[in-house]
């Protein structure tokens, strides 16, 4: 069965500068399968961000802003990167990477 | 010192158009959320829109959509409300106000630096 | 929409009194709610944020309380300054909607 680990506990950044979110995933190969990505907030409910599929598909929530995040895949390190452009105060938040194994 | 200074207010023929200007000074603009609040004569506080720092995220009262735009000039120090088809019910002083911005409590907003605002009538 | 009612909408009130005022959400927003004084012919003034968190120079007659649906603003000992309205404000997320006001007067 896979595994993910996000090895950044905690990520720091300067507003308006890019914060690049780690999800290692192992058991598995990331080729077989959907990463998603979910942030929250206190007291708020989890939201679903975006995904990206087997196939290189990627999937994005209708609500968010365009631009502000991308998602990748690299085989060769079994990670999915979640980009997030110009950080402001609305993305201080915790970030969930999930699986789905097809 | 910080401050907002709005411009642009007037009066207006019903469904006509409007364009707030909102000066900010004393602080770096462009690590704030702006937002535009409104009261009507003897009326209480309405929220209006709100902006974030690189403007990903915009917001509108439900009753605005598709008639008022927010925008900002970060290079300007500036903010913008730009309001078309105007009607009798938008007459209001329009206030700029700035988020309290990002500290130890970042999670938490609230409207900490409002300017003095701008008159806008509609009325035939 | 999540509506914001304040209660009363009016109070009369002595210097040195002790008042509260409530504000009610129509469904839970944890503790995003800040609290707004505005005097005739003046702009608001941030008094609480996060439910009850002082802002910085409010006097600390003022406090804040709650979370969810049920919040309150006290003010412990009336002082002249303070006949005046009071809004709070919700923003867990938009519309960040005010409450139609409280109006404090002397009694």
């Known amino acids: 069965a896979g595994h993910l680990e996000q090895p950044q506990i905690s990520s720091t950044k300067t507003l308006s500068k890019t914060a690049r979110l780690e999800c290692v995933v192992s058991g598995i190969t990331i080729s077989a399968t959907s990463v998603y990505w979910y942030r929250e907030r206190p007291g708020e409910v989890i939201q679903f961000l975006v995904s990206i599929s087997y196939d290189g598909t990627v999937r994005k929530e209708s609500g968010i802003p365009s631009g502000k995040f991308e998602v990748d895949r690299i085989p060769e390190t079994s990670t999915s990167t979640l980009t997030i452009h110009n950080v402001e105060k609305q993305d201080i938040a915790t970030y969930y990477c999930a699986l789905w194994e097809v | 010192e910080v401050q907002l200074l709005e411009s642009g207010g007037g009066l207006v023929k019903p469904g006509g158009s409007l364009r707030l200007s909102c000066a900010a000074s004393?602080?770096?603009?462009?690590?704030?959320?702006m937002n535009w609040v409104r009261q009507a004569p003897r009326k209480g506080l309405e929220w209006v829109s709100s902006?974030?720092?690189?403007?990903?995220?915009?917001y509108y009262a439900d009753s605005l959509k598709g008639r008022f735009t927010i925008s900002r000039d970060n290079a300007k120090n500036s903010l913008f409300l730009q309001m078309n088809s105007l009607r009798a019910e938008d007459t209001a002083v329009y206030y700029c106000?700035?988020?309290?911005?990002?500290?130890?409590?970042?999670?938490?907003?609230?409207?900490?630096?409002w300017g003095q605002g701008t008159m806008v009538t509609v009325s035939s | 929409d999540i509506v914001m009612t304040q209660s009363p909408s009016s109070l009369s009130a002595s210097v040195g009194d002790r008042v509260t005022i409530t504000c009610r959400a129509s469904q839970g927003i944890y503790n995003y709610l800040a609290w707004y004084q505005q005097k005739p012919g003046n702009v608001p003034k941030l008094l609480i944020y996060?439910?009850?968190t002082l802002q910085s120079g409010v006097p600390s007659r003022f406090s804040g309380s709650g979370s969810g649906t049920d919040f309150s603003l006290t003010i412990s000992s009336l002082q002249p300054e303070d006949f005046t309205t009071y809004y709070c404000q919700k923003y867990n997320r938009a519309p960040f909607t005010f409450g139609p006001g409280t109006k404090v007067d002397i009694k």
């Open positions: 004393g602080f770096s603009f462009s690590n704030y959320d």
């Open positions: 902006i974030s720092s690189s403007s990903h995220y915009i």
């Open positions: 996060a439910a009850s």
């Open positions: 106000a700035r988020d309290r911005g990002v500290t130890t409590d970042y999670y938490y907003y609230a409207l900490d630096v």
